[in-house]
């Protein structure tokens, strides 16, 4: 299969690879505090850490890219740290005609793979 | 709205952000010689660049991260260039049967951006 | 349409814990942005908030009950939870879950479930 | 903590007629973008309460437009302008600026 197994144990040590972690933020970090009401202050679920070889591969590609980074690291790139998935948010925001409460899809991180 | 405008000129200088790149790579190069039987070179696209604030964000999510980097530099990573969808590529292989010839969708990156 | 349902021992003796679940359905209880909320009513009384949950884990709490107080969540059963120690005769309350965006905007609340503290 | 302060504690009314509660708050409840941090809440009898107003004037889903909110700061009046028999029970302000959110002590709304 084109599939190696991807590695889930981390060999850099705990908290060393590609994981989810909490960050808060304020509206005014994010430039946010113009158009949204609440909440003010955000847990973002972001993805972080490194991604050492197969480690979470996200799919062939990501293995492939792994190997040719052990080949040729100053030419191709290792894998890193992105969303795997997302988590829904609601943020109650100023609209033209008031104030609404807006679903999005693609703000917070759910989990993470080595792309 | 969530979304700033993703800008596509590269503040960095040509061809150093987020693009497409092709890499030549031998079944040696990638450990399949044992059983990808054709193509024997492999036309490689990945994705590869730096990703300069808001510069190809994939999505409400990267733009936030980019904020947030250029905050907490040492806590929240930049975007990282990464495929946005793929090509399917047909490989010729052994099976326990014989000879097969399969697609495989997440093989080669067909275009990149900033998550 | 989100429901949320109260449950738990409606006696609780001084000194032990009183303990609540609340659980979620026709929803996540992964969504971002709602804080899972705790609100009680003393009998004949107004509403005091007690704390809040986010979907991460990140829990904030009434200063006033804080040393007793521990909100958790398990979202694999979409579920989140109250505890309350050292509970004596002025914890007695009619206790609602609720669902909020950060500390406003309860649109969303159990049916209420009345606790007493009594030996 | 942010006091909540409302009046009266008791309202009768006549169906038909127009009705007004009062809440004031020990500080302003006015953010630096423009709104005011105050929901308004009605507990019918026997029942949960229920969202009416947030943001101090925005109607929540499915609330009738007799009901609105206004005012600004620590002053603020919800106003119910013909009142029904189905309107009836205790009515709740609460600031939502900080935490922990407060609530006032509920103004009771009964037919006369």
């Known amino acids: 299969s084109a599939h190696a197994h991807p590695r889930d144990s981390c060999p850099l040590g705990p908290g060393r690879c590609c994981h989810l972690e909490t960050v808060q933020a304020t509206l005014e970090d994010l430039g946010w505090s113009d158009w949204v009401l609440s909440p003010r202050q955000l847990q973002l679920s972001m993805c972080v850490g490194e991604c050492p070889h197969l480690y979470r591969s996200a799919n062939t590609h990501a293995q492939i890219k792994a190997r040719l980074h052990g080949l040729q690291p100053d030419k191709v790139p290792a894998p890193c740290c992105v969303p795997s998935s997302y988590t829904p948010v609601v943020l109650m925001h100023r609209t033209d005609s008031g104030v609404s409460l807006q679903t999005y899809d693609d703000l917070v991180a759910r989990g993470c793979h080595c792309a | 709205s969530a979304h700033a405008h993703p800008r596509d000129s590269c503040p960095l200088g040509p061809g150093r952000c987020c693009h497409l790149e092709t890499v030549q790579a031998t079944l040696e190069d990638l450990g399949w010689s044992d059983w990808v039987l054709s193509p024997r070179q492999l036309q490689l696209s990945m994705c590869v660049g730096e990703c300069p604030h808001l510069y190809r964000s994939a999505n409400t999510h990267a733009q936030i991260k980019a904020r947030l980097h250029g905050l907490q530099p040492d806590k929240v990573p930049a975007p990282c260039c990464v495929p946005s969808s793929y090509t399917p590529v047909v490989l010729m292989h052994r099976t326990d049967s014989g000879v097969s010839l399969q697609t495989y969708d997440d093989l080669v990156a067909r275009g990149c951006h900033c998550a | 349409q989100v429901q949320l349902q109260e449950s738990g021992p409606g006696l609780v003796k001084p000194s032990q814990t009183l303990s609540l679940t609340c659980t979620v359905s026709g929803g996540s209880i992964n969504s971002g942005g709602y804080y899972w909320t705790w609100i009680r009513q003393h009998p004949g009384k107004g509403l005091e908030w007690i704390g809040a949950?986010?979907?991460?884990?990140?829990?904030v709490y009434n200063p006033s009950l804080k040393s007793r107080v521990t909100i958790s969540v398990d979202t694999s059963k979409n579920q989140f939870s109250l505890k309350l120690s050292s509970v004596t005769a002025a914890d007695t309350a009619v206790y609602y879950c609720?669902?909020?965006?950060?500390?406003?905007?309860?649109?969303?609340w159990g049916q209420g479930t009345l606790v007493t503290v009594s030996s | 903590d942010i006091v909540m302060t409302q009046s009266p504690l008791s309202l009768p009314v006549t169906p038909g007629e127009p009705a007004s509660i009062s809440c004031r708050s020990s500080?302003?409840?006015?953010?630096?973008?423009?709104?005011?941090?105050l929901d308004w809440y009605l507990q019918k009898p026997g029942q949960s309460p229920q969202l009416l107003i947030y943001l101090g004037s925005n109607r929540a889903s499915g609330v009738p437009d007799r009901f609105s909110g206004s005012g600004s700061g620590t002053d603020f009046t919800l106003k119910i302008s013909r009142v029904e028999a189905e309107d009836v029970g205790v009515y709740y302000c609460?600031?939502?600026?900080?935490?922990?959110?407060?609530f006032g002590g509920g103004t009771k709304v009964e037919i006369k």
């Open positions: 609720a669902r909020g965006v950060e500390y406003q905007h309860f649109n969303e």
């Open positions: 609460m600031q939502t600026l900080e935490a922990p959110p407060t």
């Open positions: 949950i986010y979907y991460s884990g990140s829990t």
């Open positions: 500080q302003s409840l006015l953010h630096s973008n423009g709104y005011n941090y």
